[in-house]
């Protein structure tokens, strides 16, 4: 079964920002990742960006700069530009669409008790839906 | 969460039309267009048969210009497909689908199951 897997990073350097990681463990092609906060797509979550893998990308504020890392990751930075820091407490989303066959989307958050330059391990909440 | 379901489809004689419908629910989707796309037995997916996005602008892919029409009822929620001198080779799984545009291209981000569509005598 396809997985997906969600990181949050807080910058050793500027505790103001951010950088989700996202990747898709499983076979096929992804034709479209989606990356929100607040809650998974279509869920109350706030969409953050958009990746397609040959068209480009397009994202929304507070995010600074979506890429893709190989094929199959890709990853989000922030800016937060709020005196105290909402990323910490927040839930990031990423859903990865195969279509047709389907879309594989999981959450992750920086643990309350990170040291900034550490990633939050990878321990996603698979959120399963067969399209 | 997003749910887009078909309806519509069936068998036709070569010359026949169908009228395929997209009911959506759930419909907290973000993006910024919907469209039908179809994949025909032992191929891949076509890009975007019939596509229309926020702004109304629809594009049409060549092989059914003139003789598919797209069309949307928001207060109903629903996306349609008129289909008109069909042929054989328009046979093949239709996926009613809301995604995002790049460059003009709408990228399925949600779909449905599809609907099957035979063009058979």
């Known amino acids: 079964t396809p997985e997906v897997w969600v990181q949050v990073q807080m910058e050793a350097t500027e505790l103001s920002s951010f950088t989700v990681h996202c990747g898709f463990l499983g076979p096929g092609s992804i034709s479209l990742v989606t990356v929100s906060w607040g809650g998974p797509d279509g869920a109350g979550g706030t969409k953050l960006a958009v990746l397609h893998p040959e068209l480009g990308t397009r994202q929304w504020a507070p995010a600074r700069q979506a890429r893709w890392e190989t094929q199959s990751s890709i990853s989000l930075a922030l800016e937060d530009s709020g005196a105290s820091s909402p990323f910490a407490n927040t839930t990031f989303c990423c859903k990865f669409a195969s279509f047709p066959e389907g879309s594989w989307e999981s959450c992750g958050s920086l643990p309350p008790s990170s040291d900034p330059g550490l990633s939050a391990p990878p321990t996603p909440v698979p959120i399963l839906r067969a399209d | 969460e997003v749910q887009l379901v078909e309806s519509g489809g069936g068998l036709v004689q070569p010359g026949g039309s169908l009228r395929l419908s997209c009911a959506a629910s759930?419909?907290?989707?973000?993006?910024?267009?919907m469209g039908w796309f179809r994949q025909a037995p032992g191929k891949g997916l076509d890009e975007g048969v019939a596509?229309?996005?926020?702004?109304?602008?629809?594009k049409y892919a060549d092989s059914v210009k003139g003789r598919f029409t797209i069309s949307r009822d928001n207060a109903k929620n629903s996306l349609y497909l008129q289909m008109n001198s069909l042929r054989a080779e328009d046979t093949a799984v239709y996926y009613c689908?809301?995604?995002?545009?790049?460059?003009?291209?709408?990228?399925?981000?949600?779909w449905g199951q599809g609907t099957q569509v035979t063009v058979s005598s």
């Open positions: 689908a809301a995604g995002w545009t790049f460059g003009g291209q709408c990228s399925p981000a949600d």
């Open positions: 759930g419909f907290t989707f973000s993006g910024d267009c």
């Open positions: 596509t229309i996005d926020n702004a109304g602008r629809i």
